[in-house]
């Protein structure tokens, strides 16, 4: 009998309000055994897949999707879905990315802390640190 697949979660680092030109990384999380994670933009018609999956915690796997330099056109709704053979999961909740002008003035608000649609606590990396530092990553042009 096929197992019921839990819904994935989605979060954004460093947050969901990103200054123009800054970077953002979407983090999709699902159960152990995920083969492919997909980040969808607004609807299913535009998406980006990765099979580069890491072990996030004893019960979770994750994948990361990075936009190096955020543009106004990157603002919108994002969600995750995953493939765990032999089937696809339901979609996560939507996460909204907001892009703000980076005025750089003393009164400009800080970027919001990492927020997520789904579990709010980031699972700890395993002791061998599968995660890479967030630099020089995916441009994801074909999402947009």
């Amino acid at each position: 009998q096929e197992e019921d697949l839990p819904r994935p979660s989605i979060s954004a680092e460093p947050g969901t309000v990103i200054p123009l030109g800054s970077h953002v990384t979407f983090v999709c999380r699902g159960p152990v055994g995920v083969q492919t994670f997909r980040l969808e933009r607004d609807s299913r018609s535009t998406y980006n897949d990765t099979e580069d999956v890491s072990q996030a915690s004893p019960s979770e796997s994750e994948a990361r999707f990075r936009i190096d330099s955020v543009r106004e056109g990157n603002a919108g709704l994002y969600r995750c879905i995953y493939y765990k053979p032999p089937k696809w999961s339901e979609q996560s909740d939507y996460l909204e990315l907001l892009v703000k002008e980076s005025s750089g003035g003393p009164d400009s608000p800080d970027t919001e802390p990492g927020s997520s649609a789904g579990p709010t606590q980031r699972p700890s990396d395993n002791s061998h640190n599968e995660h890479a530092p967030a630099s020089q990553g995916l441009k994801a042009e074909h999402l947009y």
């Epitope: 897949d49 890491s54 995916l138």
Partner: antibody, heavy 119, light 107 residues
């Protein structure tokens, strides 16, 4: 059909260098983590190196036995994986396999290329 | 590093026999375990991932079980084409490590 074709193996003297290549086809190379795994003659399997995809910043990982001597890299525009091997030792003699993987297991293997380190 | 202890190192069985291979990790690997089959002169073939998930195209006589540190690979009814060396491998953390292998022969 997934295809991984290694090249660049051969005979090299201890202390020498060699660069292995792996031409990949039949799948979306740039979204996959890639690996090198080796097997000494008559022995078991040993993981050598891993390189993640661009979305994970091309992060690299190495076995202790090759750290500081071997460098894994990739050229997504050419669908090619590389292993630069320097300061080679006799114990590096093995068949080297290029492997496509996802989360750390090895789903698709090339046919292997033999590296012999001998004087 | 996580050590993977695989046993037996070799075994001889008859066609139709049930064959069991075990793999013990030096620490919990949270079912991040794969099993491979390697025939002489060939590259290994992935049979099972996540301890129990059979890869597409792999015959159902192969199965995996286990959790924590202890894992088992079973061939329910040995066939002549199953003669090979079998390896377990953990992928919970780097460095990824393999068991020493089990050489399976026909009696």
């Amino acid at each position: 059909e997934v295809q991984l074709v290694e090249s660049g193996g051969g005979l090299v003297q201890p202390g020498g260098s060699l660069k292995l290549s792996c031409a990949a086809s039949g799948f979306t190379f740039n979204t996959n983590a890639m690996y090198w795994v080796r097997q000494a003659p008559g022995k078991g399997l040993e993981w050598v190196a891993r390189i993640r995809s661009k979305s994970s910043n091309y992060a690299t990982y190495y076995a202790d036995s090759v750290k500081g001597r071997f460098t894994i890299s990739r050229d997504d525009s050419k669908n090619t994986l590389y292993l630069q091997m320097n300061s080679l030792k006799t114990e590096d003699t093995a068949v080297y396999y290029c492997v496509r993987g996802g989360s750390g297991f090895f789903a698709y293997w090339g046919q292997g290329t033999l590296v012999t380190v001998s004087s | 590093d996580i050590q993977m202890t695989q046993s037996p190192s070799s075994l001889s069985a008859s066609v139709g026999d049930r064959v069991t291979i075990t793999c013990k990790a030096s620490e919990d690997i949270y079912i991040r375990l794969a099993w491979y089959q390697q025939k002489p002169g060939k590259a290994p073939r992935l049979l099972i991932s996540t301890a129990t998930s059979l890869e597409t195209g792999v015959p159902s006589r192969f199965s995996g079980s286990g959790s924590g540190t202890d894992y088992t690979f079973t061939i329910s009814s040995l066939q002549p084409e199953d003669i090979a060396t079998y390896y377990c491998q953990q992928y919970w953390s780097t460095p990824y490590t393999f068991g020493g292998g089990t050489r399976l022969e026909i009696k």
